[in-house]
């Protein structure tokens, strides 16, 4: 269920979740916001001052990376 | 050299439970997230659970949620994977293992074998 | 869940040649791992990153591919190179392995 994730369990957590998409501390700017002027929200806030699942810990998963053939 | 040396597997019923340990050397232990990753003659290897480095964050795969639960103690560097109501289709070699980035699943154990079975 | 799936299940190559496997991913992926396993033995991280090799890995293995298609080649098999190999994905949760190929000399 959900748990608070704060220091080095959160970046265990963000690392075995993301896997090789890496990740983010802030969503990047516009995600899942229609306002530019909207204040980032960071994981941080989401994950360590509140609890947060897992689906909230992979919004902070960054975007495929599209690899090149070899 | 970084050593797992799992233990505790053996032959079960259906119903009942098993606690698996894994023995950690030759590396940091408390800085290290672990897994445990299972091999079933027909299901290949899958990824069972996982346990942040200080224990305080657990993740399982659905198949064994609510009967799974992953633990640690770091002061004794040893994984532990206590195993309920256990089904035919949790046998397997159960594997301890460990990973560093981009170096996915590099650390394995030789692993233990759970047989369910009436 | 990311099905991965590997083709083919067996092949014999002779000795010297060439053996091929393939991964197939049921969504995009970043990268391939892939791993062999011996008998009795747990598996091996053999190549990351989708080329990379690991340390200690003979030059005769490499691997490539983007996307859902990937392929790990041994240009030359040799005897120690008798195993199973597995691809595997980490660019969406959970990890999921492919079945499995097993390589066998001719």
């Known amino acids: 269920g959900p748990e608070t994730l704060c220091g080095a369990e959160l970046v265990d957590a963000l690392q075995f979740v993301c896997g090789d998409r890496g990740f983010y501390f802030n969503k990047p700017t516009g995600y899942g916001s229609s306002s530019r002027r909207a204040p980032q929200t960071g994981i941080v806030d989401e994950c360590c001052f509140r609890s947060c699942d897992l689906r909230r810990l992979e919004m902070y998963c960054a975007p495929l990376k599209p690899a090149k053939s070899a | 050299e970084v050593q797992l040396v799992e233990s505790g597997g053996g032959v079960v019923q259906p119903g009942r439970s098993l606690r698996l340990s894994c023995a950690a050397s030759?590396?940091?232990?408390?800085?290290?997230?672990m897994t445990w990753v299972r091999q079933a003659p027909t299901k290949g290897l899958e990824w069972v659970a996982y346990?942040?480095?200080?224990?305080?964050?657990?993740y399982y795969r659905d198949s064994v949620k609510g009967r799974f639960t992953i633990s640690r103690d770091n002061s004794k560097n040893t994984l532990y994977l206590q195993m309920n109501s256990l089904r035919a289709e949790d046998t397997a070699v159960y594997y301890c293992?460990?990973?560093?980035?981009?170096?996915?699943?590099?650390?394995w154990g030789q692993g233990t074998l759970v047989t369910v079975s009436s | 869940d990311i099905v991965m799936t590997q083709s083919p299940d067996s092949l014999a190559v002779s000795l010297g040649e060439r053996a091929t496997i393939n991964c197939r991913a049921s969504?995009?992926?970043?990268?391939m791992h892939w791993y062999q396993q011996k008998p009795g033995q747990p598996p091996k991280l053999l190549i990351y990153?989708?080329?990379k090799l690991a340390s200690g890995v003979p030059d005769r293995f490499s691997g490539s591919g983007s996307g859902t298609d990937f392929t790990l080649t041994i240009s030359s098999l040799q005897a120690e190179d008798v195993a199973v190999y597995y691809c595997?994905?980490?660019?969406?949760?959970?990890?999921?392995f492919g079945q499995g190929t097993k390589v066998e000399i001719k």
């Open positions: 293992t460990t990973e560093d980035y981009g170096y996915w699943f590099a650390y």
């Open positions: 030759g590396f940091t232990f408390s800085n290290y997230y």
């Open positions: 346990i942040s480095s200080g224990g305080g964050s657990t």
């Open positions: 969504s995009s992926v970043s990268y």
């Open positions: 990153g989708t080329s």
């Open positions: 595997l994905q980490r660019s969406s949760y959970p990890p999921t």
